[in-house]
């Protein structure tokens, strides 16, 4: 056969669908790889061919479109499962071709099982709602094209395992779920189950998403440095280990580039002749505020090191902050017995 323009396995689209539910999968060629749509290709005499490779197999095989009740079918550039089975998992290929042209792309399809509380290995989209601010709506996602607009499906919303009925600030209305003044207690996984009738058969579509209530833009502030601060003095003897944490709070700001760093005598730690180790860590609050820590340590501090200026810096999209650490050399009290004895003329 003629050479085919092979786009390989498109791992960016790792499609996951629930077992025993309808699934409609568009050929990615027209969405991401080719500059024309299916209608144009079809009217130019190009044919779309589907085939697949089962999980843990190397053999490409045609898709069986002659299953009972048309369980798998193709409509224009869409591959339909009504419904899916667990063993439909595999790599699917759509190929567009005629006698002189060929282009194809493969993509992974994973059919996953869910339990009665909608728990599954499915990767969940995240919706962020601003805390205590206004009314937020989320819409049951990825249900377009499953049924005609004349069909009015029933929609049931759940938080975790519980159907949303009489929740104090969450209200379902068809495909939408409204949050009135979101609170941290609204964090969790929300599921819509859409039920519709097609050719006398009842189908369910299950869509789960994670809701995270995050800090509001009106609460966005420049970084706040917890440590070092004016109350703590790092008093060390030469030869001891000096450990100073730079611990900074960042309010949640969508996509903010949050950074912390140390300077020593106004220079990068690398530009100072000191053997320094810096270890960084990060933690998040329930509203995705961030606490970053950079621990600066010098194993065996010298008298010169104890005279240097150690400054912790931080910045986010709102502004900057800096704080110097109070470092000093410990004054060693006289060793009483020896020095007193010397004072009395003892040898």
């Amino acid at each position: 056969s003629e050479r085919c323009d092979d786009w390989g396995l498109d791992t960016m689209r790792q499609i996951q669908v629930f077992e025993d539910e309808p699934a409609r999968i568009k050929c990615p060629l027209f969405e991401h790889f080719l500059k024309y749509n299916y209608s144009t290709a079809h009217s130019s005499g190009l044919t779309l061919i589907w085939y697949w490779t089962r999980q843990d197999r190397d053999l490409e095989e045609p898709i069986n479109f002659r299953l009972p009740e048309n369980r798998i079918s193709k409509e224009k550039d869409v591959l339909w499962f009504r419904p899916t089975l667990l063993n439909d998992t595999g790599n699917y290929t759509c190929m567009l071709r005629n006698t002189t042209y060929c282009s194809k792309v493969a993509f992974p399809l994973e059919v996953v099982q869910k339990d009665s509380c909608f728990n599954s290995p499915m990767r969940l989209p995240v919706h962020r709602l601003y805390i205590e601010q206004g009314i937020h709506n989320i819409t049951c996602p990825n249900v377009d094209g499953y049924f005609p607009s004349s069909v009015k499906p029933s929609v049931t919303w759940y938080k975790g395992c519980t159907e949303i009925v009489n929740f104090h600030n969450v209200q379902p209305k068809g495909m939408n779920l409204s949050f009135f003044i979101p609170l941290v207690s609204n964090n969790g996984n929300y599921t819509c189950v859409v039920t519709y009738l097609e050719n006398g058969r009842l189908f369910h579509l299950t869509r789960t998403m994670t809701v995270k209530v995050v800090g509001s833009p009106k609460d966005a502030v420049p970084p706040h440095i917890y440590s070092p601060n004016d109350r703590v003095v790092y008093e060390k003897e030469p030869g001891e280990e000096l450990v100073i944490p730079c611990k900074v709070y960042f309010s949640f700001i969508m996509d903010s580039h949050n950074e912390i760093w140390w300077t020593i005598d106004g220079k990068k730690p690398d530009d100072v002749p000191v053997d320094i180790t810096i270890i960084e860590s990060v933690s998040y609050s329930s509203t995705e505020d961030e606490t970053r820590t950079q621990i600066l340590s010098i194993k065996k501090v010298t008298p010169e090191d104890l005279k240097r200026n150690y400054v912790c810096h931080a910045r986010n999209a709102e502004g900057e902050a800096e704080q110097a650490a109070k470092v000093k050399q410990k004054v060693i009290p006289p060793r009483y017995t020896v020095e007193l004895a010397c004072g009395f003329g003892a040898t």
Epitope: D255, S256, H257, E259, W261, D270, I278, I279, V282, A317
Partner: antibody
Framework: EVQLLESGGGLVQRGGSLRLSCAAS????????MSWVRQAPGKGLEWVSS????????NYADSVKGRFTISRDNSKNTLHLQMNSLRAEDTAVYYC??????????WGHGTTVTVSS | EIVLTQSPATLSLSPGERATLSCRAS??????LAWYQQKPGQAPRLLIY???NRATGIPARFSGSGSGTDFTLTISSLEPEDFAVYYC?????????FGQGTRLEIK
């Protein structure tokens, strides 16, 4: 002397994979965030991915999310970029960059990745 | 994402003249803007950081100004080695973005 040396570039078929590496020397590698920046032939600069000094925080450009993975080995002073499902538009010179808080202050010479169709 | 628009796309000047390059952000990036210089066949080099601070080893003829959305790189008196492509870059929000570049060429 502070230096970054990229390797691993080359010619690859569309849909294929490549792993770029960057050897760092002359500075305390684990103290710095690192990034990859690319430049397609005759085009401008495009940020690809960044990783924090400890390696626990990563960010990606939308154009590579799900296909590329940035990682680092602080014990070997090495930065990596695993590139899967390569496309023609990934053809570029890939620069390994030291990313200090204010800017990308040290750049490697770059390694060329060519994705053929 | 924040879009950085540089102008002009090309600037034709003679050595000794003053060059003014502009970079405009689609939303405020505070003062977290850097400028880079790139010569043919070479990696870029950091010139200016935080809108107005010269990086180590950068000559005093390079200066930067601006904050928020409008930024300027000025080269007070052009030297032959200054003819190159200049990029601005914002570091306020992810993703990090670059401008499309201004080519500074000899008239």
């Amino acid at each position: 002397e502070v230096q970054l040396l990229e390797s691993g570039g080359g010619l690859v078929q569309r849909g294929g994979s490549l792993r770029l590496s960057c050897a760092a020397s002359g500075f305390t590698f684990s103290s710095y965030a690192m990034s990859w920046v690319r430049q397609a032939p005759g085009k401008g600069l495009e940020w690809v991915s960044s990783i924090s000094g400890s390696g626990d925080s990563t960010n990606y450009a939308d154009s590579v999310k799900g296909r590329f993975t940035i990682s680092r080995d602080n014990s070997k002073n090495t930065l990596h970029l695993q590139m899967n499902s390569l496309r023609a538009e990934d053809t570029a010179v890939y620069y390994c960059v030291r990313d200090y808080y204010y800017g990308m202050d040290v750049w490697g010479h770059g390694t060329t990745v060519t994705v053929s169709s | 994402e924040i879009v950085l628009t540089q102008s002009p796309a090309t600037l034709s000047l003679s050595p000794g003249e003053r060059a003014t390059l502009s970079c405009r952000a689609s939303q405020s990036v505070n003062s977290y803007l850097a400028w880079y210089q790139q010569k043919p066949g070479q990696a870029p080099r950091l010139l200016i950081y935080d809108a107005s601070n010269r990086a180590t080893g950068i000559p005093a003829r390079f200066s930067g100004s601006g904050s928020g959305t409008d930024f300027t790189l000025t080269i007070s008196s052009l030297e032959p080695e200054d003819f190159a492509v200049y990029y601005c870059q914002q570091r306020s929000y992810w993703p990090i973005t670059f401008g499309q570049g201004t080519r500074l060429e000899i008239k």
